[in-house]
Every structure is written in C-alpha cells, then in structure tokens.
C-alpha cells in the first residue's frame, strides 16, 4: 500500500471548496465498518484537505481510508475521481493497475481487529520486531513492556510477548501496531489482507 495517503490527498485537494464542504458532511453520515469510529464533527468541519487526509489515515488507516474516501466521492457523483483513487491505491508506483481487489477485511469477523484476526500469522512471520517496538514505545508500550519484548530470544517469542499486552489495548492502539507493520513489512500485511 503506501500510495493511498498521497492519492487521498490529491483527490481531496482537487475538490472545490464547496465540494470539500459537501464531502465532510457526507463523511459524518456515511456507514462505517464495524469497529471504526467517526471523526468528531467539530474537528472535521474546520479541517483543510491536508489535515483531513491525515485524519482519515490515522482514523481508518490507508486501505480503508482510501476505500471510504472513494465511497463518499462516488456518493457525491464524482465517479471518475473515485475510480482514479481506487486505481492509484491498488497499484505499485509505475505498475499497471492491478484491478480493484475485494475490499480489505471484507471477510473479517465483525469487531475483530486485523492484528487479532491474524495473530498466529503475525507471530510466525514478522521479522522486524525491533522496528515495531521503536514505533510503539512511549505510545502503547511502557519501558518495562518494551524491555520484556526485547529480552525474548527469537522473533516469534518476541511477537508472542508483544501480543500478551494487546488485550488491554483499544482499537487505536492496535491501529498503531498495524500502521507500524505496514511501514516495516507492507508485503506481509497486503498478503494477509488478501487471505
């Protein structure tokens, strides 16, 4: 993934002031996937396109954020923009469009976060644990937890230890882990999203 944030920004900046206002109002009432919260109205209405892009990505992450943006654009009658956004987010830079995939997590159990759904695969396949720890340290991991994970001898045992702390996390904390996974091992996340 990774291209979605730029594509969302281009789409929102290419809206006129009136269209951006309409987009925000529609975003307040668009149906959301289970487990996702709504951007607060007060904050939303005052945002420019750049702030709104970052808010969409932080609330919904890139994949769902792009899908949601495309849905709202389509609802506004901007079919071509929605199509371009989806095409941009489903292709690597320079690659031919790969065709629109099924929406990520479409087979997800309602209310179950990506990292909970794919716990076993993540324990087995994540190799860049140190990178994840650095991304989570001070945000969702205490110093003690950080050290405890680092002390484990192998990557799977490190990930097991990390998962021992997740029951106390809310959705946003889990999103931080998912975002870190996207940045460190995007191919793994994409593979699991397709599975």
């Amino acid at each position: 993934m990774g291209r979605a944030r730029d594509a969302i920004l281009d789409a929102l900046e290419n809206l006129t002031a009136e269209e951006l206002k309409k987009f925000k109002l529609k975003l307040l009432s668009v149906p959301l996937r289970e487990g996702y919260g709504r951007i607060p109205r007060g904050a939303l209405l005052s945002m420019d396109a750049l702030d709104l892009t970052d808010k969409l990505v932080s609330f919904y992450l890139e994949t769902y954020g792009a899908e949601l943006t495309a849905n709202v654009l389509r609802d506004m009658g901007l079919q071509e923009m929605a199509g371009q956004l989806q095409a941009a987010t489903h292709q690597g830079s320079g690659a031919a469009p790969a065709g629109i995939q099924a929406p990520p997590q479409s087979a997800a159990k309602p209310g179950l976060h990506f990292i909970d759904q794919h716990r076993a695969a993540l324990i087995a396949r994540v190799t860049n644990v140190e990178w994840l720890l650095d991304a989570l340290y001070g945000k969702v991991l205490t110093d003690e937890q950080y050290q405890a994970v680092r002390a484990e001898p192998t990557n799977p045992s490190k990930m097991r230890k990390l998962f021992s702390f997740t029951p106390a996390w809310n959705w946003t904390c889990k999103d931080l882990l998912l975002q870190a996974l996207r940045e460190s091992q995007s191919y793994l996340v994409e593979d699991l999203e397709r599975s």
């Epitope: 730029d6 281009d10 269209e19 990505v57 941009a88 830079s93």
Partner: antibody, heavy 112, light 106 residues
C-alpha cells in the same frame, strides 16, 4: 502511467517574464497534482509549489511567492509555471512532477 | 516550514559496502520520500511512504524511520547506485526537499 512532456530550452532577458509548460498524458489530468521543482547547476532540488488542476488549489514555498505563478489548462491537460521579473538567479532547470513521475526538465537561461 | 537536513553531504563507498544516508526533519513528519538523481537526468521516485520501494528499485535498498529521523540504506553498494539522493516530506506545505547526499563509488 503518467507521462510529462516539458517545453524545450528557454532564453530570456533580465526583467522579462517566461511561461514554461508541462503536458500530461496517460491518466486523468484532474485526478492528481502537478509539482514544480527548481534545480540550479550543481545544486539541490527546491520545491516551488504544487497545483491541483481540477480545483486550481495552489500552494507555494514562501520564497517563490511573487516570483512564480502556477496554472493549469484542463482542456489541454497542460500545467504552466510563469516566472516574472527574471534575474540570473532564476537560471536553472525547472521540473514538473506528479506524485511519482517527473518531466525531463526545461532549462531556463536568463542573460542580457 | 519543515527543514530537512541530510547527512553526510558527500560520501564514497566501496562495492559490497553497507551505506546509510540520514534525513533529519525540524519537526515531526508522518512519512519520508526519497529520490535518486544522476547527473544530467531527472530525479527518479525511489522510496515512498518511508519504507516502500518504487517500481524497479533493487531490493538492496530500504528505508526506515519515524517522527523526525529517517534513513535510506543500501545493504551492498553497487556501482550503479552512485548518484545523489534527496529526501522529501509531504506532511506539511511547502513539501520541502533535503539538501541531498552525493554517493560516490570508491
């Protein structure tokens, strides 16, 4: 995939204005951004500004406000940068770029 | 505006050597982008969203970082990697570039 074709070498006198073009093909012009970048000989890249063609939203680096104006003609899928009150400091290669792709650059020489 | 400071400004590396170029931002950014430029040519889109390689970029390249500290790493330097590398942030307007790191082959 987007292709960007820029105008050729430009020669201009100090104090004059010049308009450089960047023609896009291969994708919907109004669905992405066009960024302009300046590079003087042997120097680094300087971000001038960006235009979003559908809305005509533009953003500039403070340094280039008053010097550069970005416009876009949707009918011809062409973006433009106009540089005014030219001095020798404006002599450089000017690139246009989308998110991922760059034009070949236009060399502007300002000389009396 | 966000100022990006690249280091080193110039460096040389032997074939097979590991190379790391850093980019430090004056305030926190969400992602970093990297471009490669060889003399007389346009810059090439190289790494996007901090760690994703653009199409055609060899797997020996990688990107990492968060907040104000980012880096581009070449696991084993090759002659074709000799170029100038620029970082760029797109988190705040203006979307500034770093001053560049010229990488030479020994």
């Amino acid at each position: 995939q987007v292709q960007l074709q820029q105008s050729g070498v430009e020669l201009a006198r100090p104090g004059a204005s010049v308009k450089l073009s960047c023609k896009a093909s291969g994708s919907t012009f109004t669905s992405y951004s066009i960024t302009w970048v300046k590079q003087r000989t042997g120097q680094g890249l300087e971000w001038i500004g960006v235009i979003y063609p559908r809305s005509d939203n533009t953003y500039y680096d403070e340094k280039f406000k008053g010097k550069a104006t970005l416009t876009a003609d949707k009918s011809s899928s062409t973006a433009y940068i106009e540089l005014r009150s030219l001095t020798s400091e404006d002599s450089a290669v000017y690139f246009c770029a989308t998110r991922d792709y760059w034009g070949q650059g236009t060399t502007l020489t300002v000389s009396s | 505006q966000i100022v990006l400071t690249q280091s080193p400004a110039i460096m040389s590396a032997s074939p097979g050597e590991k190379v790391t170029i850093t980019c430090s931002a004056s305030s926190s950014v969400s992602y970093m982008y990297w471009f490669q430029q060889k003399p007389g040519t346009s810059p090439k889109f190289w790494i996007y969203s901090t760690s994703n390689l653009a199409s055609g970029v060899p797997a020996r390249f990688s990107g990492s970082g968060s907040g104000t500290s980012y880096s581009l790493t070449i696991s084993r330097m090759e002659a074709e990697d000799a170029a100038t590398y620029y970082c760029q942030q797109r988190s705040n307007y203006p979307f500034t570039f770093g001053s560049g790191t010229k990488l030479e082959i020994k």
